[in-house]
Interface confidence: low
């Protein structure tokens, strides 16, 4: 499932190349392993901004599919409680390209520990 999430992220990267979306997104670029689920939820929350800003049906569908895949993967880990993690709005704001790169890194972290 996480591998498919990366495929969708790459697809989103390709789709936004032709668009001018100047949104900045809350981005965790240095994810601590004990906060990875919290960070992932922030990424999923902010991903909806890309869908909203783009107004593009293909991006919307890909984002929707990615979120479902990620949620399925998260729930297969069971209910993980993390504490002392940053709130989404405490994270640094970065452009979409950097956001997607950091998103790929956190997904790889999940792949490496699954």
């Amino acid at each position: 499932n996480w591998v498919n999430v990366i495929s969708d992220l790459k697809k989103i990267e390709d789709l936004i190349q032709s668009m001018h979306i100047d949104a900045t997104l809350y981005t965790e670029s240095d994810v601590h392993p004990s906060c990875k689920v919290t960070a992932m939820k922030c990424f999923l929350l902010e991903l909806q901004v890309i869908s909203l800003e783009s107004g593009d049906a293909s991006i919307h569908d890909t984002v929707e599919n990615l979120i479902i895949l990620a949620n399925n993967s998260l729930s297969s880990n069971g209910n993980v409680t993390e504490s002392g993690c940053k709130e989404c709005e405490e994270l640094e704001e970065k452009n979409i390209k950097e956001f997607l790169q950091s998103f790929v890194h956190i997904v790889q972290m999940f792949i490496n520990t699954s």
Epitope: E46, N71, N79, T81
Partner: antibody, heavy 118, light 107 residues
Framework: EVQLVQSGAEVKKPGESLKISCKVS????????IGWVRQMPGKGLEYMGI????????RYSPSFQGQVTISADKSISTAYLQWSSLKASDTAMYYC???????????WGQGTLVTVSS | EIVLTQSPGTLSLSPGREATLSCRAS???????LAWYQQKPGQAPRLLIY???RRATGIPDRFSGSGSGTDFTLTISRLEPEDFAVYYC????????FGQGTKLEIK
């Protein structure tokens, strides 16, 4: 079309238990958080807590921690708010709402009126 | 916990006038996480503004939001009869807080 349909009004006695529901349709249930909001008669909105149906992660407002239980059943796209022992002060309208873009509440249920009286 | 204080508690204006509602936070709030809701008697609240200044789907352009840090404003440029209601601000994101509300009534 996104819809949140809540269960009907309830009249209960102090000390009784209760579970009210919020059935969603029109979107993928696991994609968004679902929050619960209390509104006591003639008063403002009070945030109670929120659940992420994707993995059942649940967060409570400090005021409601230990007073209620929020849960969700992915198989029937339904969120719940539960009391084990009602008090007269629980008399209120309770709303469920979807945490949409950036997690603000973009769609709301019609509300469930809970009356607790001896 | 962040406290949101709305003012005035009640605002009396005539249709056609401009309404300015204030929401002040006890500590700085990211503008991406500030919303405004409208609630009419016997109805559920309705989202008007999110991200401090973005209008929700279907909301008329006479509603606008602004502000940053600790001070946020909802402006209704030309009051229509259906705009008289209670308005709430909300800080959302990882934690949620509502203001106590401002009642907008017909003068």
């Amino acid at each position: 079309e996104v819809q949140l349909v809540q269960s009907g009004a309830e009249v209960k006695k102090p000390g009784e238990s209760l579970k009210i529901s919020c059935k969603v349709s029109g979107y993928f249930f696991t994609t968004y958080w679902i929050g619960w909001v209390r509104q006591m008669p003639g008063k403002g909105l009070e945030y109670m807590g929120i659940i992420y149906p994707g993995d059942s992660d649940t967060r409570y407002s400090p005021s409601f921690q230990g007073q209620v239980t929020i849960s969700a059943d992915k198989s029937i796209s339904t969120a719940y708010l539960q009391w084990s022992s009602l008090k007269a002060s629980d008399t209120a309208m309770y709303y469920c709402a979807r945490g949409g873009n950036w997690n603000c509440f973009d769609y709301w249920g019609q509300g469930t009126l809970v009356t607790v009286s001896s | 916990e962040i406290v949101l204080t709305q003012s005035p508690g009640t605002l009396s204006l005539s249709p056609g006038r401009e309404a300015t509602l204030s929401c002040r936070a006890s500590q700085s709030v990211s503008s991406s996480y500030l919303a405004w809701y409208q609630q009419k008697p016997g109805q559920a609240p309705r989202l008007l503004i999110y991200g401090a200044s973005r209008r929700a789907t279907g909301i008329p352009d006479r509603f606008s939001g602004s502000g940053s840090g600790t001070d946020f404003t909802l402006t209704i440029s030309r009051l229509e009869p259906e705009d008289f209601a209670v308005y709430y601000c909300q800080r959302y994101g990882s934690s949620h807080t509502f203001g106590q509300g401002t009642k907008l009534e017909i003068k």
